[in-house]
Amino acid sequence: ILWHEMWHEGLEEASRLYFGERNVKGMFEVLEPLHAMMERGPQTLKETSFNQAYGRDLMEAQEWCRKYMKSGNVKDLTQAWDLYYHVFRRISKHHHHHH
């Protein structure tokens, strides 16, 4: 599965868990393997392209999640979701444009 599809599906599920179920722990459990995949690095040209387009925002979002886990400060979580939302919108637009 392509990275943009995995992230699109992952962010859908993360938004269900956070905004639907109010399950922050579940949300992190969905996002953690996706961030781990990014940390392992791109293996193909498409993954390299994805990493260049979204890698920085997703890394920053992960940092805000880690801050939240330490601090419990909801503002850290909103910063993370600002970035996830930005990435989600861009993936959705790009994906829609090419299909």
Partner: antibody, heavy 123, light 107 residues
Framework: EVQLVESGGGLVQPGGSLRLSCAAS????????IHWVRQAPGKGLEWVAS????????SYADSVKGRFTISADTSKNTAYLQMNSLRAEDTAVYYC????????????????WGQGTLVTVSS | DIQMTQSPSSLSASVGDRVTITCRAS??????VAWYQQKPGKAPKLLIY???SLYSGVPSRFSGSRSGTDFTLTISSLQPEDFATYYC?????????FGQGTKVEIK
């Protein structure tokens, strides 16, 4: 076509009980989120309660906690609001609304609402 | 609880006017804000979700924007059918909360 139809409203005395129903059609009810929102006469909107049809997880406003119970019957595609120990301040039009969580679906927001059912608590 | 402070509570405007309604969240809510239109005796209708996304079927004269915890609904050119009450609403945390409403009346 998505439809939500409330029923069960009416006149009840303080301390009495009432059960509201919200019949849903036109979407996958078993994986949806249904909320109740009320509006007192001439006032604004107030969120009351929510339920996840799949997990049955629920949330309540402090003003109704311990008195109201939200539930869902996926075999009947219907959500319920059981209202006990009713007070004059519970007088309102009660709306059920579908809540969508996902950015791609048009959320997080209430995308479809029922027509509302009036609950009047008075002696 | 997160307070959504909406202003103004009412306004008078003419057809063709540009109308702006604002909502300030008492704490950060990311972009989890929606706007609704309600007419007397009717259920609210979704206009804007995720602060700035136009809901399907809503005329393009409606738009939403965000600056931090300040959210704005703009009607670029008011039409006769737009005279109604408008509400903002946050979904970031439970309890979900609404603004007090803005009644848009004919001048």
């Amino acid at each position: 076509e998505v439809q939500l139809v409330e029923s069960g409203g009416g006149l009840v005395q303080p301390g009495g009980s009432l059960r509201l129903s919200c019949a849903a059609s036109g979407f996958n009810f078993s994986s949806s989120y249904i909320h109740w929102v009320r509006q007192a006469p001439g006032k604004g909107l107030e969120w009351v309660a929510s339920i996840s049809s799949s997990s049955s997880s629920t949330s309540y406003a402090d003003s109704v906690k311990g008195r109201f119970t939200i539930s869902a019957d996926t075999s009947k595609n219907t959500a319920y609001l059981q209202m006990n120990s009713l007070r004059a301040e519970d007088t309102a039009v009660y709306y059920c609304a579908r809540y969508v969580y996902s950015y791609s679906q048009g959320g997080p927001a209430f995308d479809y609402w029922g027509q509302g059912t009036l609950v009047t608590v008075s002696s | 609880d997160i307070q959504m402070t909406q202003s103004p509570s009412s306004l008078s405007a003419s057809v063709g006017d540009r109308v702006t309604i604002t909502c300030r969240a008492s704490q950060s809510v990311s972009s989890a804000v929606a706007w609704y239109q309600q007419k007397p005796g009717k259920a609210p209708k979704l206009l804007i979700y995720s602060a700035s996304s136009l809901y399907s079927g809503v005329p393009s004269r409606f738009s939403g924007s965000r600056s931090g915890t300040d959210f704005t609904l703009t009607i670029s050119s008011l039409q006769p059918e737009d005279f109604a009450t408008y509400y903002c609403q946050q979904s970031w945390s439970v309890p979900i909360t609404f603004g007090q409403g803005t009644k848009v009346e004919i001048k």
